[in-house]
Interface confidence: medium
C-alpha cells in the first residue's frame, strides 16, 4: 500500500504593514508544534497594496475598502480555506500616522476605524488596527532580525545560514529608514542607558537583553527630504530653488501648501511671497550633504554623547542589519555590496549625482521619474545620516550589513510584532522533548 | 421585502443565559453587518456589539464585552446574540439592526427587528 | 467614546408647531449622523441619516441640518402621528453611540 501523505500541520499569521508611502501585506507560516521554536516561522508571501499610505485616505476614507482588497484577497487564496478562521490578521500603523495623529487625534482614529471595518469583513480572526510606537517600531525591527538570523537560539551552528552571519551569539544592531521615520536600536556594550525613553529589557529564550532604541519622527527619507526643502526654500531669493539634491537639468514645481502640509516642516514654515516654486537640480554631492546636515541640530546634548537633535545614542557596538529603505536605495545604487567602503560609497554617489537628469532616464527608463528623481538626495541622505547622524565611521562602516531579506523572509518590524502577539517567543528556553524531532512508533 | 424577524420573549432567572435569533430575509445576509441593541424599560438605546457576518467578526461594548456573544449562521442568515450571567438589570428588549458595510456612510441602522423582550426575575 | 448629548429630554407642543431637537458630540462627527423615531412597543424607525438625507418613505416635513460637532432635527409643522420619542444616533466611530431621546408630547 501506497504512504498517504499526512496533512501539513502548520498555522499562519498575516501583518499589514501600514506605511507613510504605502502599505504591504506579509503572510507568515510555521509548524503548529514548533511554535516556540527559534526561526521556524517564515514569509510565505508579501503583497504591496497598490497606491499610497493610508494616512492619505484622510479625505477619502471610502476608498480604503477597495485598496485593501486585491492583498486581502491574495492572502485568502495563500492561505488554505481550512486555516482562514485560525489566522490571526494584524495591521501595524507607523509614522505616516503619527503624522496624521499629531495633526488630528480625530482624522487618524477616523481611518482606523474604516480599515478595522475593512478588514473585519474577511474570513480571518482579525485582531486590530493600531498605530505602533516608534519604540514598539524599533524594537520589533531587532527581533525579527535576530530572530531570522538565529541569534536567540543557544545552539550555536557549525555553519553559516547567511553571508554576514558570525557565529556567536552576539545580535544584531538594527537600523530601519521609512519614509517618515528612522530608527535604530541594538544593544550596548556595558553602557548605560542614559535615557529611560531609550531603554528596552527583554527576556527571550532564557537570556535577558538591555537594548537601546530610538525613533526620530520626521526623519524618514520622504519626511526629510520636505524638511530640507522647506529649509531651503526660506533663503531662496525667488520662486527658483537651485538644489544640488537633484540631477542637473531636472524640473520640478512644488506647491508651498503641499510643503507646509506636513508636521514635519513647521519649524521652518514662513509666509512666502509666491504659492509655487520650481525645484531646479544641479547635482552636487557635497553641497547636497552640506544642506542635509543642517538638518541635524548636534549643537546641544544633554547626555554624555548623542545622536542629533539632543537625543542620546551611546557608542556603537556589533554588526547592524539596514534594511526597509536604507536596503532599497543602496540596493537601486548597486551599493550593497559588503565589498564597498564607506569612501568608495561616497565616490559613487558623487559620480551618481552629477550626472544629467537626462542621461539618468535614459539609463533607467523602467523606473518611475517621482522615485528617480529622488535617489540622489535618498542615497545622499543615508550616507548623512548613517555618519553624521549615527556617528558610524569609515572603519565601522563595513558592520554595517545592507539587508533586503534573510532565509526569504523580509527584514523590518512586522514579523517580530507577530512572534510578540502570537506569544512566540518564550521568556524561557524552551525544554527540548524527545518527541520534538522525531516519532517513535 | 427586507426584513429581520426575531424569536420570542424569555423570562429568565438570574445567573441564567438567554439566547435570542434574528433572522434576516430580502437581501444578501453578508452584505450588511448586524447590531444588536437593548433598551431597557423607559429608557434609551444602548449597543451591546457587531458582528460581519462574512467573517464572524465581532465588537463588543466594553460593557458587555465578557458576557454577550454574537454569532451567525450563513447557511439560515440568521444572527444570534447569547447573554450570560443575567442579572435583573438585564431585563429589557433586545433589538437586531442591520448596517451597511461598505461606505462609512452606510453605517447607520436602517433596518431593525421587532425586538425581543427578556425578562430576568426570580 | 463619543458622548452624544440630546436635548430637551422631553417637550410638548401644539399641532402644526415648528419642533426643534438637537443632538451635540463631544467631538466633531462629520455629519455622520441619523435620526430615529421610536413609539411606544416598536422598534426605532430611521428617518434621517447623514444629517439631512430624508429615507424614503418619510415625509418632507421632517428635515436635518448641522455639522462638526452641533446637529439640528426639526418638524416643520407638527402631526399627531408624530407624537413619539426621538433619538440620534452618531455612526462616526465604529463605537456608535445614542442620544439619550427626546419624548415629544402633544399638548
Known amino acids: 500500500t501506497q504512504n498517504k501523505a499526512l496533512p501539513e500541520n502548520v498555522k499562519y499569521g498575516i501583518v499589514l504593514d501600514a506605511g507613510s508611502s504605502h502599505t504591504s501585506l506579509y503572510i507568515y507560516k510555521w509548524p503548529a508544534e514548533k511554535e516556540n521554536d527559534t526561526g521556524v516561522v517564515h514569509q510565505v508571501e508579501e503583497c504591496r497594496v497598490k497606491g499610497p499610505g493610508i494616512s492619505k485616505f484622510v479625505q477619502k476614507v471610502n476608498e480604503i475598502g477597495i485598496y485593501l482588497t486585491d492583498c486581502m484577497e491574495r492572502a485568502r487564496e495563500v492561505i488554505p480555506r481550512s486555516q482562514h478562521q485560525e489566522t490571526p490578521v494584524y495591521l501595524g500603523a507607523t509614522a505616516g500616522m503619527r503624522l496624521l495623529r499629531m495633526e488630528s487625534e480625530e482624522l487618524a482614529d477616523r481611518v482606523l476605524d474604516v480599515v478595522e471595518r475593512s478588514l473585519s469583513n474577511y474570513p480571518f480572526d482579525f485582531q486590530g488596527a493600531r498605530i505602533i510606537t516608534g519604540q514598539e517600531e524599533g524594537a520589533y525591527g531587532w527581533i525579527t532580525i535576530n530572530y531570522l538570523l538565529g541569534k536567540f537560539s543557544q545552539k550555536t551552528r557549525w555553519f553559516s545560514i547567511v553571508p554576514y552571519e558570525t557565529n556567536n551569539q552576539e545580535t544584531f544592531g538594527a537600523l530601519d529608514l521609512g519614509g517618515a521615520s528612522t530608527q535604530v536600536t541594538f544593544v550596548p556594550q556595558n553602557q548605560t542607558i542614559e535615557s529611560p525613553d531609550n531603554a528596552l529589557q527583554f527576556r527571550l529564550y532564557g537570556k535577558d537583553y538591555n537594548v537601546y532604541t530610538h525613533s526620530f519622527l520626521c526623519y524618514g527619507k520622504d519626511q526629510a527630504l520636505w524638511q530640507k526643502l522647506a529649509k531651503d526654500i526660506q533663503v531662496a531669493s525667488n520662486e527658483i530653488l537651485r538644489d544640488p539634491c537633484f540631477h542637473p537639468g531636472y524640473k520640478k514645481v512644488v506647491n508651498v501648501s503641499d510643503l507646509y502640509k506636513t508636521p514635519c516642516t513647521k519649524r521652518f514654515e514662513m509666509t512666502l511671497p509666491f504659492q509655487q516654486f520650481e525645484i531646479q537640480g544641479i547635482g552636487n554631492y557635497q553641497q547636497c550633504h552640506q544642506s542635509i546636515l543642517e538638518l541635524f541640530n548636534t549643537s546641544y546634548c544633554p547626555y554624555s554623547q548623542c545622536a542629533f537633535n539632543g537625543i542620546f545614542l551611546p557608542p556603537l557596538q556589533g554588526d547592524f542589519g539596514a534594511f526597509s529603505a536604507f536596503y532599497f536605495v543602496m540596493k537601486f545604487l548597486n551599493l550593497t555590496s559588503e565589498k564597498v567602503s564607506q569612501e568608495k560609497v561616497t565616490e559613487m554617489m558623487k559620480k551618481f549625482c552629477a550626472q544629467p537628469w537626462e542621461e539618468i532616464k535614459t539609463s533607467y527608463a523602467g523606473v518611475k521619474e517621482k522615485y528617480l528623481s529622488e535617489y540622489c538626495f535618498s542615497g545622499t541622505y543615508i550616507l548623512s545620516l548613517l555618519l553624521q547622524g549615527y556617528h558610524f565611521t569609515a572603519d565601522s562602516w563595513e558592520h554595517i550589513h545592507f539587508i533586503g531579506k534573510i532565509q526569504g523572509s523580509d527584514a523590518g518590524w512586522t514579523l517580530g510584532y507577530m512572534l510578540n502577539l502570537t506569544n512566540m517567543i518564550p521568556a524561557e528556553q524552551p525544554l527540548s522533548t524527545p518527541l520534538s524531532h522525531s516519532t517513535y512508533v | 421585502q427586507v426584513q429581520l424577524v426575531q424569536s420570542g420573549a424569555e423570562v429568565k432567572k438570574p445567573g441564567a443565559s438567554v439566547k435570542v435569533s434574528c433572522k434576516a430575509s430580502g437581501y444578501t445576509f453578508t452584505n450588511y453587518w448586524m447590531y444588536w441593541v437593548r433598551q431597557a424599560p423607559g429608557q434609551g438605546l444602548e449597543w451591546i456589539g457587531r458582528i460581519a457576518p462574512s467573517s464572524g467578526a465581532t465588537k463588543y461594548n466594553e460593557k458587555f464585552k465578557n458576557r454577550a456573544t454574537l454569532t451567525v449562521d450563513t447557511s439560515i442568515s440568521t444572527a444570534y446574540m447569547e447573554l450570560s450571567r443575567l442579572r435583573s438589570d438585564d431585563t429589557a428588549v433586545y433589538y437586531c439592526?442591520?448596517?451597511?458595510?461598505?461606505?462609512?456612510?452606510?453605517?447607520?441602522?436602517?433596518?431593525w427587528g421587532q425586538g425581543t423582550t427578556v425578562t430576568v426575575s426570580s | 467614546d463619543i458622548q452624544m448629548t440630546q436635548s430637551p429630554s422631553s417637550l410638548s407642543a401644539s399641532v402644526g408647531d415648528r419642533v426643534t431637537i438637537t443632538c451635540k458630540a463631544s467631538q466633531d462627527i462629520n455629519k455622520y449622523i441619523g435620526w430615529y423615531q421610536q413609539k411606544p412597543g416598536k422598534a426605532p424607525k430611521l428617518l434621517i441619516h447623514?444629517?439631512?438625507t430624508l429615507q424614503p418613505g418619510v415625509p418632507s416635513r421632517f428635515s436635518g441640518s448641522g455639522s462638526g460637532r452641533d446637529y439640528t432635527f426639526t418638524i416643520s409643522s407638527l402631526q399627531p402621528e408624530d407624537i413619539a420619542t426621538y433619538y440620534c444616533?452618531?455612526?462616526?466611530?465604529?463605537?456608535?453611540?445614542f442620544g439619550q431621546g427626546t419624548k415629544l408630547e402633544i399638548k
Open positions: 439592526a442591520r448596517s451597511g458595510i461598505y461606505y462609512d456612510y452606510d453605517w447607520f441602522f436602517d433596518v
Open positions: 447623514y444629517t439631512s
Open positions: 444616533l452618531q455612526y462616526h466611530a465604529l463605537l456608535f453611540t
